[in-house]
Amino acid sequence: MVSHIGSTRFALFLLCCLGTLMFSHTGPIYQLQPKEIQAIIVELQNLSKKLLDDYLNKEKGVQKFDSDLPSCFTSDSQAPGNINSSAILPYFKAISPSLNNDKSLYIIEQLDKLNFQNAPETEVSMPTDNFERKRFILTILRWFSNCLEHRAQ
């Protein structure tokens, strides 16, 4: 019997589509200043890398990274150069309980600060199969960490 590791039941929207969908809604309640946004992004770059290292038991090897993963930044004119937190938040909220790590909770806090939209949040549920769950978590952590790192360069 095949365990459907790639099953879409726990991913209601593709990451690449989420940003566009979410940012088409209402305008910002409070517009963070560019310097504030930049400070949060720098902090998230460091945190996401540490969180990935924690999850990988301090694995320092070169990770395979494909640059055609969806961008974690929005192209929205209202928030130029801002992290597409609406797209990322549901995934971080889904994986956070499994990580049991203060860093993930802090990342969620920071992403919340960058989430200017009032759009309803997408439900993302964690897969039940152990292997699927590990793959899902690692995919999200790598995607976010690599995405931020890629932008920093």
Epitope: V2, S3, I5, G6, L14, N57, G61, K134, L138
Partner: antibody, heavy 118, light 113 residues
């Protein structure tokens, strides 16, 4: 660099058991799953199963569930596969192979040639 | 189980020729989270262990010559060797790692004329 070291050959009697080893070098052992693959002479590759060295979670190909048992010794960064009730059908090359669960199996051991003969 | 079908089972070509081989899966290998196909291509030379050529259906492993190209999505995949060299004599396997058991194709044996 990454290396998976396997003994070259094992000769065992029918009905006996054997424990094949795979020692990992050059990376954090607990960060990658370990796969085991069987290849009979002149044949293709057959996936036996895999183990997560961080917590010993295993997944088996159903056809090998009663044949193979995968274990880990974290202290020596070694993966093991025990094969039981051996017959001539078990004579094959057995490979261990490291898997990054988001990408693929990227490094293979050289394989252990198992010969079951009386 | 996901069935992987490779064709042809063998082919003989001259050095410098272009080669394509096919791999079909019985169900889609596309992982929705990162939009990657969980399919790899391996090269196994006589008496050696398999070597990773391509992962995610189209991403070339570092150190693999650029004459090797993987393409396809969903259920249909192709490995292309743009200009065959004598050292490419080997059996080429595709493998899915989308759902376990992680099944292999039966292989395509490349022979040099």
């Amino acid at each position: 660099q990454v290396q998976l070291q396997q003994p070259g050959a094992e000769l065992v009697r029918p009905g006996a058991s054997v424990k094949l080893s795979c020692k990992a070098y050059g990376y954090t052992f607990t960060s990658y799953w370990m796969n085991w693959v069987k290849q009979r002479p002149g044949q293709g590759l057959e996936w036996i199963g895999m183990i997560d060295p961080s917590d010993s979670e295993t997944h088996y190909n159903q056809i090998f569930r009663d044949k193979a048992t995968l274990t880990i010794d974290k202290s020596s960064s070694t993966a093991y596969m025990q094969l039981s009730s051996l017959t001539s059908e078990d004579s094959a090359v057995y490979f261990c192979a490291r898997q990054d669960i988001v990408t693929t199996v990227d490094y293979w051991g050289q394989g252990t040639t198992l010969t079951v003969s009386s | 189980d996901i069935v992987m079908s490779q064709s042809p089972s063998s082919l003989a070509v001259s050095v410098g020729e272009k080669v394509t081989m096919s791999c079909k899966s019985s169900q889609s290998l596309l992982y929705s989270i990162n939009q990657k196909n969980f399919l790899a291509w391996y090269q196994q030379k006589p008496g050696q262990s398999p070597k990773l050529l391509i992962y995610w259906a189209s991403t070339r492993e570092s150190g693999v010559p650029d004459r090797f190209t993987g393409s396809g999505s969903g259920t249909d995949f192709t490995l292309t060797i743009s200009s065959v060299k004598s050292e490419d004599l080997a059996v080429y396997y595709c493998q899915q790692h989308y759902g376990y058991p992680f099944t292999f194709g039966s292989g395509t044996k490349l022979e040099i004329k």
